[in-house]
């Protein structure tokens, strides 16, 4: 296994609809043709997998049908979008990139993006 640098923004604020997007960029040492991208959430020293996708260079990222993530790739950049976020989902979201093919295998882990999610205030009842 060889190490690889992965860059991602330090902070992102989710939209009022609970959608957060960020770019995950990796410094590929060669021409990878198969890449696996995983988003992990770290909270209270526990790490859980949010979503993952394996894609061939030049093709779309395909997450599972029930995934809360979508994404697109362009060169060594992956544009990730996480949907359905609520205030309780605020936390550190880490981008992990694995170059699966051709050998050798490379693993890169970003420092994480702190995603802040603020639940929208309910509209007050109005009397007319």
């Amino acid at each position: 296994c060889k190490a690889m640098h992965v860059a991602q923004p330090a902070v992102v604020l989710a939209s009022s609809r609970g959608i957060a997007s960020f770019v995950c960029e990796y410094a590929s040492p060669g021409k990878a043709t198969e890449v696996r991208v995983t988003v992990l959430r770290q909270a209270d020293s526990q790490v859980t997998e949010v979503c993952a996708a394996t894609y061939m260079m030049g093709n779309e990222l395909t997450f599972l049908d029930d995934s809360i993530c979508t994404g697109t790739s362009s060169g060594n950049q992956v544009n990730l979008t996480i949907q359905g976020l609520r205030a309780m989902d605020t936390g550190l979201y880490i981008c992990k990139v694995e170059l699966m093919y051709p050998p050798p295998y490379y693993l890169g882990i970003g420092n994480g993006t702190q995603i802040y999610v603020i639940d929208p205030e309910p509209c007050p009842d109005s009397d007319f």
Epitope: C1, T33, E34, Q42, A52, I94, M100, L107
Partner: nanobody
């Protein structure tokens, strides 16, 4: 915890064929590179063939055209079809799974199965 169990080894004559199988606990093929390695007496362990989650395969030069790696996601097995076997293919063959789990690198090995090519 990933467990790998190999089977299919044995004694075969030069020019013969064998099919090795590796049973994995759980469906790990979507996240791990699966591979077969071998270690001959007095030699270092070497990679024979690998298959990625996307189905890409890679072979050692010494086995290209003779060995074929494949996987069955439904059965959670990775097979190595070995044809035109030579005495120099004699070794203990190990199944391997490598990739990452959480924030760390993971590598798992089976216990190995002996392949002997001799007349």
């Amino acid at each position: 915890e990933v467990q790998l169990v190999e089977s299919g080894g044995g004694l075969v004559q030069p020019g013969g064929s064998l099919r090795l199988s590796c049973a994995a606990s759980g469906n790990i093929f979507s996240r791990y590179i699966m591979g077969w390695y071998r270690q001959a007496p007095g030699k270092q362990r070497e990679s024979v063939a690998t298959i990625t989650p996307g189905g890409n395969t890679d072979y050692a030069d010494s086995v290209k055209g003779r060995f074929t790696i494949s996987r069955d996601g439904a059965k959670n097995t990775v097979d190595l079809q070995m044809n035109s076997l030579k005495p120099e293919d004699t070794a203990v063959y190990y199944c391997n799974a490598r990739g990452s789990s959480g924030l760390s690198m993971s590598t798992y090995w089976g216990q190995g199965t002996q392949v002997t090519v001799s007349s």
